[in-house]
Interface confidence: low
């Protein structure tokens, strides 16, 4: 028969034949042959593989580093990675939760409505017309646009929720 060019789900093609992939939680020791099945071995302690695979090494479980404010939310198994979270009162800096900050920051265009406490996170609000925030901050409120008039200047560039107005000198060449 013709050697296969594609294999079924949970199989892989090697040496012109289809071998079974190793199930989650196991790694590949040796490929199948005409006479033997794929040989797989369970991942060791603190290791995992979360898909049907042909990996020769299992992945290490994520380390929740207490020096970064992290703790284990869910212990890893041979089929799943460890899930880290932050200590109470702290918040992950990303979805992957690789480090923690005390307060979540408000992005440019948003200001802090309420600073975080030990039990509640920062509350942000969009800067309304006439106000701006050009920084990512856990403390700073929206700042009012500069009043050009009070400085005897005119608006040369309008402000946005992320930028202040740009003031400039009055045009003296009036008809």
């Amino acid at each position: 028969p013709e050697p296969p060019t594609a294999c079924r789900e949970k199989q892989y093609l090697i040496n012109s034949q289809c071998c079974s992939l190793c199930q989650p939680g196991q790694k590949l020791v040796s490929d199948c042959t005409e006479f033997t099945e794929t040989e797989c071995l369970p991942c060791g302690e603190s290791e995992f593989l979360d898909t049907w695979n042909r990996e020769t090494h299992c992945h290490q479980h994520k380390y929740c580093d207490p020096n970064l404010g992290l703790r284990v939310q869910q212990k890893g198994t041979s089929e799943t990675d460890t899930i880290c979270t932050c200590e109470e009162g702290w918040h992950c800096t990303s979805e992957a939760c690789e480090s923690c900050v005390l307060h979540r920051s408000c992005s440019p265009g948003f200001g802090v409505k309420q600073i975080a406490t030990g039990v509640s996170d920062t509350i942000c609000e969009p800067c309304p017309v006439g106000f701006f925030s050009n920084v990512s901050s856990a403390f700073e409120k929206c700042h009012p646009w500069t009043s050009c008039e009070t400085k005897d200047l005119v608006v040369q560039q309008a402000g946005t929720n992320k930028t202040d107005v740009v003031c400039g000198p009055q045009d003296r060449l009036r008809a």
Epitope: S99, C100, S105
Partner: nanobody, 120 residues
């Protein structure tokens, strides 16, 4: 290796004062933004005060404004927290912490803490 050692905690009556110290080593203290945090029994960590590395700018939690003062002595690699007019709700373990910046505090590193108990 960053090392922070807090001291100065103790038992004090309401209305009394305490001065906490934090001895720092293992990093360039003068260029680090530093802060004090506290954890009351059964509660989460709460920010108390920050002092920036640049210009020594400070900021305080509303609950301690006007009563607590954060300061630093870069020559001695030491951070201080002067606590006046202490109240029962100030009872907590106080931690000294390094941070990336005053705007976006990072967990960074912290010491073992010093216990402050305000009780009559």
């Amino acid at each position: 290796e960053v090392q922070l050692v807090e001291s100065g905690g103790g038992v004090v009556q309401p209305g009394g004062s305490l001065r906490l110290s934090c001895a720092a080593s293992g990093f360039t203290f003068s260029s680090a933004t530093m802060g004090w945090f506290r954890q009351a029994p059964g509660k989460g960590l709460e920010w108390v005060a920050y002092i920036s590395s640049v210009g020594g700018g400070t900021d305080y939690a509303d609950s301690v404004k006007g009563r607590f003062t954060i300061s630093r002595d870069n020559a001695k690699n030491t951070l201080y927290l002067q606590m006046n007019s202490l109240r029962a709700e100030d009872t907590a373990v106080y931690y000294c912490v390094t941070m990336r910046s005053i705007r976006n505090p990072d967990f960074g590193s912290r010491g073992q803490g010093t216990l402050v108990t305000v009780s009559s």
